[in-house]
């Protein structure tokens, strides 16, 4: 019955980027300005989403897809569908409710986004510290001590912290 | 010893999903980045993006933002990557990788996935 | 993106030569630069990390040098098993990037 119902349904020829208009006799009608509809046979269309404030345009509303937002320079996306902008703090920070911290001694933060993490412990894996590690940076490990040959320095000092750092995604 | 053991070959129409995984054994899981590269036909590598398994913190490559998705699974270390949307352009060997420690190498590369998008 | 430009593309030596390939950075990279061999089989693996830093297990014959933008990797004689195609790589900024590769082939 259901299939019988969907093939004599009118509304099932509509295509995306149209809607089924139950005030013009069923007919597909295209979707308004500001609007869309992404699969066929909808009643309705929906209203565009619109980038404003700290949101910008990452590709237009078509009348077949919605509108998609990112963030504004200085900020950076949270959520599905970049539902939220988060402001970017520098490598060797975290956000924090009374804004950008620095990262305590033993984390760092590489990127503008996310939180300070613990330095990479080497020795989980039988390695040892081969670049100590920043706020900027994460230790580089190496080999463990006894693949080291005699006479050779284990830590190299970290290398300089730069901008930009890992750029936020 | 520390392996990434992938799931096999997939054939997938366009428009559809794929998932593929990628089972870690030999290490603490959450310790260490996952990572998913792939490369296309007689093409080169490419970074798709990572995941840090003990919080689920993710990176994406900007260009592949839309089409995978990176999750893990701490219960049973695996980690998974799945493209939607599939196009022939996306038919291409996946590989998973895990860091040497610390993010910035890849020490341990799964045998790789082949995904083959065709109608 | 960081641009990684590998050369040559391509190159054909006999066993015993000394074999070099150079990678360059679009941007200073400082020493994150790595070195990945793959086999015709498809396995990847990692040879050289943060330069010159030789994973445990690989051969004395390989090597890497460099800094900043500019990288080389060399086999000092080259082996009928170092049939491959080798990569760099720059874990310096996100998102990673690779050199197009350079095939490598026994004369």
């Known amino acids: 019955f259901e299939r019988t119902r969907s093939l004599q349904d009118p509304c099932s020829n509509c295509p995306a980027g149209t809607f089924c208009d139950n005030n013009r006799n069923q007919i597909c009608s295209p979707c308004p300005p500001n609007s869309f509809s992404s699969a066929g046979g909808q009643r309705t269309c929906d209203i565009c989403r619109q980038c404003k404030g700290v949101f910008r345009t990452r590709k237009e509303c078509s009348s077949t897809s919605n509108a998609e937002c990112d963030c504004t320079p200085g900020f950076h996306c949270l959520g599905a569908g970049c539902s939220m902008c988060e402001q970017d703090c520098k490598q060797g920070q975290e956000l924090t409710k009374k804004g950008c911290k620095d990262c305590c001694f033993g984390t760092f933060n590489d990127q503008k986004r996310g939180i300070c993490r613990p330095w990479t412990n080497c020795s989980l894996d039988g390695k040892s510290v081969l670049v100590n590690g920043t706020k900027e940076r994460d230790v580089v490990c190496g080999p463990s001590p006894a693949d080291l040959s005699p006479g050779a320095s284990s830590v190299t000092p970290p290398a300089p912290a730069r901008e930009p750092g890992h750029s936020p995604q | 010893q520390v392996q990434l053991v992938q799931s096999g070959a997939e054939v997938k129409k366009p428009g559809a999903s794929v998932k593929v995984s990628c089972k870690a054994s030999g290490y603490t899981f959450t310790s260490y980045w996952i990572n998913w590269v792939r490369q296309a036909p007689g093409q080169g590598l490419e970074w798709i993006g990572n995941?840090?398994?003990?919080?689920?913190?993710?990176n994406y490559n900007q260009k592949f933002k839309d089409k995978a998705t990176i999750t893990a699974d701490k219960s049973t270390s695996t980690a998974y990557m799945e493209l939607s949307s599939l196009r022939s352009e996306d038919t291409a060997v996946y590989y998973c990788?895990?860091?040497?420690?610390?993010?910035?190498?890849?020490?341990?590369w799964g045998q790789g996935t082949t995904v083959t998008v065709s109608s | 993106d960081i641009q990684m430009t590998q050369s040559p593309s391509s190159l054909s030596a006999s066993v015993g030569d000394r074999v070099t390939i150079t990678c360059q950075a679009s941007?200073?990279?400082?020493?994150?630069l790595n070195w990945y061999q793959q086999k015709p089989d498809k396995t990847v693996k990692l040879l050289i990390y943060y330069t010159s830093r030789a994973r445990s297990g690989v051969p004395s014959r390989f090597s890497g040098s460099g800094s900043g933008t500019d990288f080389t990797f060399t086999i000092s004689s080259l082996q009928p098993e170092d049939i491959a195609t080798y990569f760099c790589?720059?874990?310096?900024?996100?998102?990673?990037?690779f050199g197009q590769g350079t095939k490598l082939e026994i004369k």
């Open positions: 995941i840090y398994p003990s919080d689920s913190y993710t």
């Open positions: 941007q200073d990279i400082s020493n994150y």
């Open positions: 790589q720059q874990g310096d900024t996100l998102p990673y990037t």
């Open positions: 990788t895990r860091d040497y420690g610390s993010a910035y190498s890849m020490s341990t």
